[in-house]
Interface confidence: low
Amino acid sequence: LQPGAEVPVVWAQEGAPAQLPCSPTIPLQDLSLLRRAGVTWQHQPDSGPPAAAPGHPLAPGPHPAAPSSWGPRPRRYTVLSVGPGGLRSGRLPLQPRVQLDERGRQRGDFSLWLRPARRADAGEYRAAVHLRDRALSCRLRLRLGQASMTASPPGSLRASDWVILNCSFSRPDRPASVHWFRNRGQGRVPVRESPHHHLAESFLFLPQVSPMDSGPWGCILTYRDGFNVSIMYNLTVLG
């Protein structure tokens, strides 16, 4: 991260896989060193420390201090360290949820994957990529949101009832686009504006439902930064 640069924010959905991107610009003369590159990912949680003591005796490089008496908030700790020979070390309970793509690493992509991401994973992440005597770094802030779809009125509906479906993700900015769809067999059928379906931002209004409307309804929220989330809701209409 160069001085003056903003720390990028990466959004992820709780319970879904999350990618923490890190593809630093590798000088051409160092490309041959990628096979032997080491990477250390550090995490400073946003709030209360996850269980287990920070640091790991096997992790190469410095270990952060335990959060006991120093600092009013959790300390940074090593999430995962991969040495030149592929030797891994890290800290439970994140493993084995934490993964690096080995093939990606040889292409200069040191992204960290959380499979799945949990609320406690929110916070600042820093990666140090070590190439011989050179260290490149990535820095980002992971924010986690919850996705939900609610129906108003809730519960089972009768034929000719109306319903409003609201698709939401706990993120402060509005989605750039909202797409509604229905699952039919193996495919998705887009829901378009019609006398039966009224679309307004993240809301879908069905003025008169019928038993044919029973089944899964879905929406995809896409944000300006490219993050998207898919949410499903099972509608029940009684004949």
């Epitope: 001085p3 490089g61 201090a65 820093r126 140090a128």
Partner: antibody, heavy 121, light 107 residues
Amino acid sequence: QVQLVQSGAEVKKPGASVKVSCKASGYTFTESPMNWVRQAPGQGFEWMGIIYTDTGEPTYAEEFKGRVTMTRDTSTSTVYMELSSLRSEDTAVYFCASDYGSILYWYFDVWGQGTLVTVSS
Amino acid sequence: DIQMTQSPSSLSTSVGDRVTITCKASQDVSTAVAWYQQKPGKSPKLLIYSASYRYTGVPSRFSGSGSGTDFTFTISSVQPEDFATYYCQQHYNAPPTFGQGTKLEIK
């Protein structure tokens, strides 16, 4: 670019207090905590404490507890360090220092220009 | 607190010479040692962190090594602008502590 600009030199009498400011620019102020480190004339460095700029919560080194207060003003991206009950041995250059580009805490890649505080009767 | 003992306290050298400064920690600090350069009336500049990693923009003549308790800082070929005081610092845990400094002087 990333910059920390400190307030000017101060001359104080023993027993008085001094408040030094450190204004950050070139980055998002709340993304990096701020440390205060002092250097007595011809001496090495002594870490005084850290303030987490997002929450405003400080942590002080044992030797300064009860005498130092660190605060921040996010509206002006400024951190303050106040040292009370000054004595002659507090004569030093006081630096604010951030770990802006660090991978770990506790080393400092961005420093203010320093503020000389002289305590003399 | 972890004590950092730096030696020598001063060193006279000439342009082009190779210079080595050592730092000893009072306990194991893994590879968590940084090195700074300070010129009179100026703030310190970070040169090396994590014992051996050069900070952005630092010339390759500056290098560091070591782990555990013994650390070395080397300038492979001293340049005129390198005459300054150098400090080691452990960043293993809080409170961060510094060595007393090594003043590099022109012979």
